[in-house]
Interface confidence: medium
């Protein structure tokens, strides 16, 4: 009688993550007997995946009843399939013995490989806010993938980004791999409303790429620029004077009225004007009793935007063309908030 | 189905014996055949069993010591039995099974079994 | 080893179960012997195949690792040594149980 043959027909299967790996393995032959065992790997730390003699196996079922009689089909099927269940698997038949049974005929093995889909790609931005012109760098990261080829690309609002770094981890074989990119984006003026797109395109993903995004508005400062302008007279002895601060972002803003270097009020950016460009403008406004001063003063408007150093600009009052008002010693009015805020 | 036993009776100790079994009707070819062993008082004891394939299978006990094989064209299986010993004495059953082949990777002769002989009685004593 | 109680024991009518316990990937078979000596007679082959001779009262199943010959409406005749068959569950040689006593009471 022909030597029994174990036949493994399948050189490699392909299976998504989560779903079922059918293995094949048939003999040839009923002897001689002993049970059959699988195995992924081979040599002396081959993992034993099913043993048809004993031993619980939660995750393998047979597909054909291995208590028929004349049973020659040894094919399994490997449930909840992950990365980590890749490999190559052999089909094995024991011959009975005494104690133990013998390694009689393996197969020529199975490959499975996992097909894993990559995870959504986190776009993380740079620690500290930066203002325009300057340059920042993104990064983008995917794991868990299967197998290692996987294409990544950046947008900023809908325009592919040419400056950028990627690595896909780790070199060599694994059972899943992950992905690591790093952009680097100029910032411009107009970005508070830009969007930094990170997009994974793999062969899980079916032509439906996955897409991590970095809103600009989380990493731009956009610093404010300052008008200090006098307004016409309101009464006889009373300067209107206004500190326009425009195009700022974030919103986060302290102005302080400095008359001669003392402070005279402090006041935050509450009630703000949005530009179209989601950048913001404010207005505050300052009555100076001119009747109060004998000599020229000068007015600061003084900004503190985002916890940075503070900007000012000044703006010097003539005083001695106006008469002085006997009894005043108010140097300026300090109006309520919505009289001193202009929209 | 009939199985009739021979050549049992009495045996010196370190001796051969051979016992076979002719059976009738059924297809004997078909079927895998075995021996099982009874011991005064004690009970049933597989001893041997050949497959479709002629491969063939022994007890424990007379593992080294038996041979099993088959006459499909006589319709006899033949156990011989070398190397006696007291404990070899009993009545030697032939057994048919109830198919052919193995399942679960494995021939279990005991556990298919669907006809017997009567029994050939071996006596093992000087 | 293939593993059975010694002894059972029933009143006529009752429900008898004799349970083997052995390897958990092979078959059974059960095997009665009125009288030491005498041809056994088969029972149950297979784990749950009756020969078409043999009375519906006899049935076998299996769970696991353990087979149980049911008798049900158990008669004074069913009096005997009932053996199960089987492999060894570690050496996958083929054995028979110790042999369980059926009393009839």
């Known amino acids: 009688e022909e030597e029994l043959q174990v036949i493994q027909p399948d050189k490699s299967v392909l299976v998504a993550a989560g779903e079922t790996a059918t293995l094949r393995c048939t003999a040839t032959s009923l002897i001689p007997v002993g049970p059959i065992q699988w195995f992924r790997g081979a040599g002396p730390g081959r993992e034993l995946i099913y043993n048809q003699k004993e031993g619980h196996f939660p995750r393998v079922t047979t597909v054909s009843d291995l208590t028929k009689r004349n049973n020659m089909d040894f094919s399994i099927r490997i449930g909840n399939i992950t990365p980590a269940d890749a490999g190559t698997y052999y089909c094995v038949k024991f011959r009975k013995g005494s104690p133990d049974d013998v390694e009689f005929k393996s197969g020529a093995g199975t490959e499975l490989s996992v097909r894993a889909k990559p995870s959504a790609p986190v776009v993380s931005g740079p620690a500290a806010r930066a203002t325009p012109q300057h340059t920042v760098s993104f990064t983008c990261e995917s794991h868990g993938f299967s197998p290692r080829d996987i294409t990544l690309k950046w947008f900023k609002n809908g325009n592919e980004l040419s400056d950028f770094q990627t690595n896909v981890d780790p070199v060599g074989e694994s059972v899943s791999y992950s992905i690591h990119s790093t952009a680097k984006v100029v910032l411009t003026r107009e970005d508070v409303h830009s969007q930094v797109i990170c997009e994974v395109a793999h062969v899980t993903l079916q032509g439906d790429p996955l897409r991590g995004t970095a809103n600009l508005s989380e990493t731009i400062r956009v610093p404010p620029t300052l008008e200090v302008t006098q307004q016409p007279v309101r009464a006889e002895n009373q300067v209107n004077v206004t500190c326009q601060v425009r195009k700022f972002y974030p919103q986060r803003l302290q102005l302080t009225w400095l008359e001669n270097g003392n402070v005279s009020r402090t006041e935050t950016a509450s009630t703000v004007t949005e530009n179209k460009d989601g950048t913001y403008n404010w207005m505050s406004w300052l009555l100076v009793n001119v009747s109060a001063h004998r000599d020229d003063v000068k007015l600061t408007c003084q900004v503190e935007h985002d916890g940075q150093p503070a900007v000012s600009k000044s703006h010097d009052l003539k005083v001695s063309a106006h008469p002085k008002e006997q009894g005043s010693n108010t140097a300026a009015e300090n109006t309520g908030s919505n009289e001193r805020n202009i929209y | 189905v009939t199985l009739d036993e021979s050549g049992g009776g009495l045996q010196t100790p370190g001796g051969a014996l051979s016992l076979v079994c002719k059976a009738s009707?059924?297809?004997?070819?078909?079927?895998?055949m075995g021996w099982v062993r009874q011991a005064p008082g004690k009970g049933l004891e597989f001893v041997a069993a050949i497959y479709s394939g002629n491969s063939a299978e022994y007890g424990a006990a007379v593992q080294g010591r038996a041979t099993i094989s088959r006459d499909n064209g006589q319709s006899t299986v033949r156990l011989q039995l070398n190397n006696l010993r007291a404990e070899d004495t009993g009545i030697y059953f032939c057994?048919?099974?109830?198919?052919?082949?193995?399942?679960?990777?494995?021939?279990?002769?005991?556990?298919?079994?669907?006809?017997w002989g009567h029994g050939t009685e071996v006596i093992v004593s000087s | 080893a293939v593993t059975q109680p010694a002894s059972v024991s029933a009143n006529p009518g009752e429900t008898v179960k004799i349970t083997c316990s052995g390897s958990?990937?092979?078959?059974y078979g059960w095997y009665q012997q009125k009288s030491p000596g005498s041809a056994p007679v088969t029972l149950i082959y297979e784990t749950n195949k009756r020969p078409s001779n043999i009375p519906s009262r006899f049935s076998g199943s299996k769970s696991g690792s353990t087979a149980t010959l049911t008798i049900t409406g158990v008669q004074a005749d069913d009096e005997a040594v009932y053996y199960c068959?089987?492999?060894?569950?570690?050496?996958?040689?083929?054995?028979f149980g110790a042999g369980t006593t059926l009393t009839v009471l």
């Open positions: 009707g059924f297809t004997f070819s078909s079927f895998n």
């Open positions: 057994a048919k099974d109830a198919g052919s082949g193995c399942y679960s990777g494995v021939c279990a002769g005991t556990s298919s079994i669907d006809a």
């Open positions: 958990s990937s092979g078959s």
């Open positions: 068959g089987s492999e060894d569950s570690s050496t996958y040689l083929s054995i």
